[in-house]
């Protein structure tokens, strides 16, 4: 696994312990909580990051209206079960044997049940809508400059292929970033949109996951872009299955 050889650290994940005990004395980094070896040349999966976090000593408008099937992560943090590749297991359960099904970004997509609950497959989240509100500025940002800056950010900081950034919408003070990635589009080695969105979310909150790098300093033509609110909507390839009680609540 690639890691900075000079001092054996993981540039893309500070929630690791790295030691020169890999093959041939190479640096090997293991995610806190799970102990899984991670590839430090790319983003770590959201599942392993959440597990590490839990183990640590915590209409005519251009804007998109989220679909009726869009999920928002209202359940907050939990200690997830990850598969050997670091992906979320389709079924998650807590200490009291309450279980639920999740999508590929770990967001609950069914009502909660007991241990008999079946989650046949991990349903892929293929469309992520990141909804941001920026702090007041002297004037609106130039849309094309903003678009270019956010695309550059996802390409350079999160290593997300540009084709997966479907659109950047802007209506002051709301910015929306649309990420799309179908199962068929994702090739081996491609960063997952769910992982990129999670790194971005943590960056926006001032909780960068990168090792030793400064926090996110977003600027558009030199003007700081300061985010004061973030909402992320997740759309799955198969719509979620909630009871009518929840849908009408």
């Amino acid at each position: 696994h690639t890691a900075a050889q000079d001092n054996c650290t993981c540039p893309t994940n500070k929630m690791t312990v790295c030691s020169p005990d890999g093959p041939g004395g190479r640096c090997q980094c293991r995610a806190l909580g799970s102990g899984m070896a991670v590839d430090c040349s790319t983003l770590t999966s959201k599942c392993l990051l959440l597990k590490a976090r839990m183990s640590a000593p915590k209409n005519a408008r251009t804007l998109v209206r989220p679909s009726e099937h869009a999920l928002v992560d209202n359940d907050g943090l939990y200690d997830p079960d990850c598969d050997p590749e670091g992906r979320f297991k389709a079924r998650q359960c807590n200490q009291t044997s309450v279980c639920w099904c999740v999508n590929s970004v770990g967001v609950r997509r069914t009502d909660k049940g007991d241990l008999s609950l079946r989650c046949d497959e991990l349903v892929r989240t293929h469309h992520i809508l990141i909804d941001l509100r920026h702090r007041p500025t002297a004037g609106a940002f130039n849309h094309s400059d903003l678009d270019a800056e956010l695309r550059r950010l996802f390409r350079e900081r999160y290593r997300l292929h540009p084709k997966f950034v479907a659109a950047v919408h802007y209506e002051q003070p709301t910015i929306q970033i649309e990420l799309r990635q179908n199962t068929s589009q994702k090739a081996a080695g491609d960063v997952d949109i769910g992982d990129a969105a999670y790194y971005f979310e943590r960056d926006i909150k001032g909780e960068s996951l990168f090792q030793g790098r400064g926090g996110l300093d977003l600027r558009v033509r030199g003007e700081p872009l300061q985010v004061e609110r973030t909402l992320i909507y997740y759309l799955d390839e198969i719509p979620p299955k909630f009871s009518m009680k929840r849908l009408t609540a």
Partner: antibody, heavy 117, light 107 residues
Framework: EVQLVQSGAEVKKPGASVKVSCKAS????????INWVRQAPGQGLEWMGN????????NYNQKFKDRVTMTRDTSTSTVYMELSSLRSEDTAVYYC??????????WGQGTLVTVSS | EIVLTQSPATLSLSPGERATLSCRAS??????IAWYQQKPGQAPRLLIE???ESISGIPARFSGSGSGTDFTLTISSLEPEDFAVYYC?????????FGGGTKVEIK
């Protein structure tokens, strides 16, 4: 030559605690994980947890989480494993082991801990 | 946690025979498996890492194979000193776990 030398055998009463030491030499102490593995008489091997001496990060097997504490002293290149609230089923040989690649390459000689009233 | 199941529990063979020991993981662990030999009163000795990579100083008659969930340790021709207990161990994720062991005894 890499060496892991453990403290001597201990006899303890139920409810007591035991602290086993493991002194490392022949390599950079802070660079490699030290794991603790135990083996009850006639039984198999059981991983208890590990410590990374560089920053004292510890990870414990859930089975022992509330009773085990692993610490290190970099000045003496020594790792300690303390197990509290001892019971008869804790009678075992306790090994420290240094981890390399995918295996436990170096082992201490083992420390027999006997729990008896 | 990842459960490792070793079979058979006991293998009765004669010197010169070939020994085939199996280790099955409860989930895919790639090649994150190691094999150990343990003799009475001694600490375990690492034989194989990464499922198939031999450790320097270990005789060439010991070899490992497999990936995913099924792994095998083969001793091509048993020597008298090879009669011992053999354990597999996974290091894919914490908690690290060992198989229950296979005892290779003289027939």
């Amino acid at each position: 030559e890499v060496q892991l030398v453990q403290s001597g055998a201990e006899v303890k009463k139920p409810g007591a605690s035991v602290k086993v030491s493991c002194k490392a030499s022949g390599y950079t102490f802070t660079s490699y994980w030290i794991n603790w593995v135990r083996q009850a008489p006639g039984q198999g091997l059981e991983w208890m947890g590990n410590i990374y001496p560089s920053n004292s990060y510890t990870n414990y097997n859930q089975k022992f989480k509330d009773r085990v504490t692993m610490t290190r002293d970099t000045s003496t290149s020594t790792v300690y494993m303390e197990l509290s609230s001892l019971r008869s089923e804790d009678t075992a040989v306790y090994y420290c082991s240094s981890y390399r690649s995918e295996g436990f390459a170096y082992w201490g000689q083992g420390t027999l801990v006997t729990v008896s009233s | 946690e990842i459960v490792l199941t070793q079979s058979p529990a006991t293998l009765s063979l004669s010197p010169g025979e070939r020994a085939t020991l199996s280790c099955r993981a409860s989930q895919n662990i790639g090649t994150s498996i190691a094999w150990y030999q343990q003799k009475p009163g001694q600490a375990p000795r690492l034989l194989i890492e990464f499922a198939s990579e031999s450790i320097s100083g270990i005789p060439a008659r010991f070899s490992g194979s497999g990936s995913g969930t099924d792994f095998t340790l083969t001793i091509s021709s048993l020597e008298p000193e090879d009669f011992a207990v053999y354990y597999c161990q996974q290091s894919n994720s914490w908690p690290f776990t060992f198989g229950g062991g296979t005892k290779v005894e003289i027939k």
